[in-house]
């Protein structure tokens, strides 16, 4: 059984305040069986910022379509971005359970936020 | 509220072909993945096909691979299912279900009845 | 293939538990579907292992280990009378695979 990684290609994503961020997430094996979600920031305070099974969350859209069975890339766009977005955002695998229990982490994305050019 | 509406069924004779519709309203039918389920007479319930959200992507049973086809329209919230070369072992009643994120099901049409007979 | 039991039976208030097994847990979700009689439209009561739609009582309810699932129904009623189905998706195949269904009887 291929060991599950979860690859976060970008370090660091810059983007200016009210375009759309592009986080880019893959995972290279579809088990164990579970949801994706994606954070900003880390530890108890993190922020939900999207979750396969559940939604929905108006500001984020996945690039790739999900729904296809065999779907191994859940990277996300997030739209009007401002300041307030600023952060670490970390693509997670989750194992199926009651509750679901965290699996594997990605290394994580730092979007920074630039000046809206004038 | 979420509802499927299949249309299409009928008796024809072994050999011909069929086309069921499913008319979906009271959600976002270009967001889930769809699919259709058979129950022959005294018999249990079959998954026939799948097909992702936008389309692109379809799945099969081995019984039904070749000879029908799932498909959709989102343009008019529509679900779709060709079959062709029917035989008796096809007579059922065919039911189209909306699919969670992980491909169970969680809502169902009230069935169409098709007949194949000589 | 899953494998359910052909039948069971209970009083009313009584718990009834159904089983489903053949599945893998790492590559399988489970489902339970209700159908009150043949033809008529399945009602899906658990999706996810253990995910209730809102609609449904709370008195159902499913669980999943190993390589099997489980439906209970806590205080089971009349109107529960129906067939059972267990589905599973394996992420291996792709596919979706039913239970023959277990009927419930309340005497």
């Known amino acids: 059984e291929e060991e599950l990684q979860i690859i976060q290609p970008d370090k660091s994503v810059s983007v200016a305040a009210g375009e759309s961020a592009i986080l880019h997430c893959t995972i290279t094996s579809l088990f164990p069986v579970g949801p994706i979600q994606w954070f900003r920031g880390a530890g108890p305070a993190r922020v939900l910022i999207y979750n396969q099974r559940q939604g929905p969350f108006p500001r984020v859209t996945t690039v790739s379509e999900t729904t296809k069975r065999e779907n191994m890339d859940f990277s996300i766009s997030i739209s009007n971005i401002t300041p307030a977005d600023a952060g670490t955002y970390y693509c997670i695998k989750f194992r199926k359970g009651s509750p679901d229990t965290e699996f594997k982490s990605g290394a994580g994305t730092e979007l920074s936020v630039r000046a809206k050019p004038s | 509220d979420v509802q499927l509406v299949e249309s299409g069924g009928g008796v024809v004779r072994p050999g011909e072909s069929l086309r069921l519709s499913c008319a979906a309203s009271g959600f976002t039918f270009s967001s889930y993945a769809m699919s259709w389920v058979r129950q022959a007479p005294g018999k249990g319930l079959e998954w026939l096909a799948g097909i992702s959200a936008g389309g692109s992507d379809a799945y099969y049973i081995d019984s039904v691979k070749g000879r029908f086809t799932i498909s959709r329209d989102n343009s008019k919230n529509s679900l779709y299912l060709q079959m062709n070369s029917l035989t008796a072992e096809d007579t059922a009643v065919y039911y189209c279900?909306?699919?969670?994120?992980?491909?169970?099901?969680?809502?169902w049409g009230l069935g169409t009845l098709v007949t194949v007979s000589s | 293939a899953l494998t359910q039991p052909a039948s069971v039976s209970a009083n009313p208030g009584e718990t009834v538990k159904i089983t489903c097994s053949g599945g893998?847990?790492?590559?399988?979700?489970y489902g339970w579907y209700q159908q009150k009689s043949p033809g008529s439209a399945p009602v899906t009561v658990i999706h996810s292992d253990d995910k209730r739609p809102s609609d449904i009582p709370s008195r159902f309810s499913g669980s999943a280990s190993g390589s099997a699932a489980t439906l209970t129904i806590t205080g089971v009623r009349v109107e529960d009378e129906a067939v059972y189905y267990c589905a599973g998706y394996d992420g291996r195949t792709y596919i979706n695979t039913f239970g023959a269904g277990t009927t419930l009887t309340v005497l």
């Open positions: 893998d847990w790492y590559s399988t979700y």
């Open positions: 279900a909306r699919e969670t994120w992980n491909h169970l099901f969680d809502y």
